[in-house]
């Protein structure tokens, strides 16, 4: 069990040459609760989104987004019909963001190479993004001890580790492997973080009643990495990881709460539902 | 806890426009859809549109295109919904709604009469 | 636009009884690649706003009780009552989840007998 990853390819349809479609994957085995797709940078740090997919309350999309959808259970792709002559796309970047439990918030770019002919590849040059993300969560000598040894181990780990099991057979996209922090526990969430936050609502007193396919089960089967002619490489960015954190400032005291009193921080609240989530969610 | 509060009862005559609030509370209101909904007297629900407050990017019912327009203001975490050129059967109770009609305003009846 | 149609207008079911309403989309809300329907269900009183029940056709809102269930697939979905309460006297809508525009059913108007 790998520590997450997520994937974004930027496509151009080779058919017509202002039509662009973003994939992204979530690798990893959690339950994705939600998915933001952005542009011109991550969701919150100045990027506008264009879609936000909900694995059953469904979509929104704003233009240029023409179609959000879920490919798997844990890949989504959204078609952009570009209305400019210049094709704006070319030079974009697109962020997508999995929300999942337990992992936590995970986001990932990508932007359509330099070369605007559908079907060539250029190298991709991962740029990290850097977000305080951590800030206030653990005492500073607390993170930096935990967190230097952790990288050190995953650094070490990676450098053993042979080429990613879900790396596609074209050379046109690549399976991020960067790793990052991941949460360790819902006491986290009593800090502020506007952009980073997840479902918490995971409830194993409750699977019995939970829907089959809702956000109790945890997939596990590999993302779907589009193929095809069209393909074109992805510029990657950097995955990033976040612990779980509350989107709404009023809820930054809830630690003070007891158990299960309303939108609290708890390991398991409330354990199914959009009211329940929406004050975990920074996005829509 | 999540809340929608919406501006009170409205008359208009036909012809007019009539601008309706919906300030929400207990979230981040640049992050999430503020949806629009209305209801005909003994009749169904309608969508009419959704804003996103962070980058105002709106989504139009094509029914009410031209007629209606959308608009959010982050500093007050007050979204609006206008409607122009009523008439007698734009008469209902005109609802907002946020996280895919997971919540609600306590709705604005809008009467159109002469 | 999907159309959806609901059966019947108005039901009237006695106290302790099993409630049934359906609901058929004009396309298919599911959606293949994650094999989810999106349907969802709402409850209004009067002089209230809808109150969401179920979501994704069978995933029950939090805090409805469990009385309530939602099933079906595709174009063809069903809310069920197992047995009903006086509270539950409202109006049903089921709403398209899947593509824009969000379109709601006509209603069904729930009495007891």
């Known amino acids: 069990a790998g520590t997450p990853e997520v994937w974004v390819q930027v496509q151009m349809e080779a058919t017509e040459l202002s039509s662009f479609t973003v994939h992204c994957g979530f690798l990893g085995p959690g339950s994705i609760s939600l998915v933001t797709v952005s542009w011109g940078g991550p969701d919150g740090a100045g990027g506008t989104k264009l879609a936000v997919l909900h694995p059953e309350l469904g979509t929104r999309q704003w233009a240029p987004a023409r179609q959000a959808r879920w490919e798997t259970q844990s890949s989504i792709s959204l078609a952009l019909e570009d209305s400019g002559a210049s094709s704006p796309f070319a030079n974009t970047t697109f962020c997508c963001k999995f929300a999942s439990f337990p992992e936590g918030s995970w986001e990932s770019c990508g932007s359509l190479p330099p070369s605007s002919d559908p079907g060539l590849s250029a190298p991709p040059t991962p740029v990290p993004i850097l977000r305080a993300d951590l800030a206030g969560i653990l005492g500073l000598s607390g993170v930096l001890l935990f967190g230097c040894g952790y990288l050190l181990h995953l650094l070490r780990r990676q450098k053993h580790r042979p080429t990613p099991r879900l790396q596609p057979s074209h050379t046109n996209s690549q399976a991020l492997t960067a790793q990052a922090w991941a949460p360790s526990q819902a006491s986290q969430a009593a800090l502020h973080d506007p952009y980073a936050t997840i479902n918490t609502s995971f409830c194993p007193a409750t699977l019995d009643t939970a829907h089959p396919n809702g956000w109790a089960s945890l997939p596990t089967h590999a993302a779907h990495q589009p193929q095809g002619p069209a393909a074109s490489a992805s510029t990657p960015i950097l995955a990033r990881g976040s612990f779980v954190s509350v989107e709404n400032g009023l809820y930054t005291q809830a630690g003070e709460r007891p158990p299960h009193t309303g939108p609290g921080l708890t390991l398991f609240p409330d354990c199914r539902g959009p009211r329940a989530l929406e004050g975990r969610f920074g996005v829509r | 806890e999540v809340q929608l509060v919406q501006s009170g009862a409205e008359v208009k005559k036909p012809g007019s426009s009539v601008k309706v609030s919906c300030k929400a509370s207990?979230?981040?209101?640049?992050?999430?859809?503020i949806e629009w909904v209305r209801q005909a007297p003994g009749q169904g629900l309608e969508w009419m549109g959704e804003?996103?407050?962070?980058?105002?990017?709106?989504n139009y019912n094509e029914k009410f295109k031209g007629r209606v327009t959308i608009t959010a203001d982050e500093s007050t975490s007050t979204a609006y919904m206008e409607l122009s050129s009523l008439r007698s059967e734009d008469t209902a109770v005109y609802y907002c709604?946020?996280?895919?009609?997971?919540?609600w305003g306590q709705g604005t009846l809008v009467t159109v009469s002469s | 636009d999907i159309v959806m149609t609901q059966s019947p207008d108005s039901l009237a079911v006695s106290l302790g009884e099993r409630a049934t309403i359906n609901c058929k989309s004009s396309?298919?809300?599911?959606?293949?690649?994650?094999?989810?329907?999106?349907l969802a269900w709402y409850q209004q009183k009067p002089g209230q706003p809808p109150k969401l029940l179920i979501y994704g056709a069978s995933t029950r809102e939090s805090g409805v009780p469990d009385r309530f269930s939602g099933s079906g697939s595709g174009t063809d979905f069903t809310l069920t009552i197992s047995s009903l309460q006086a509270e539950d006297v409202a109006v049903y809508y089921c709403?398209?989840?899947?593509?824009?525009?969000?379109?709601f059913g006509q209603g069904t108007k729930l009495e007891i007998k």
């Open positions: 207990g979230g981040t209101f640049s992050s999430f859809s």
């Open positions: 804003i996103l407050p962070g980058s105002n990017s709106t």
């Open positions: 396309q298919s809300l599911l959606n293949s690649g994650n094999q989810k329907n999106y």
């Open positions: 709403q398209n989840a899947h593509s824009y525009p969000p379109t």
């Open positions: 709604a946020r996280y895919w009609f997971a919540y």
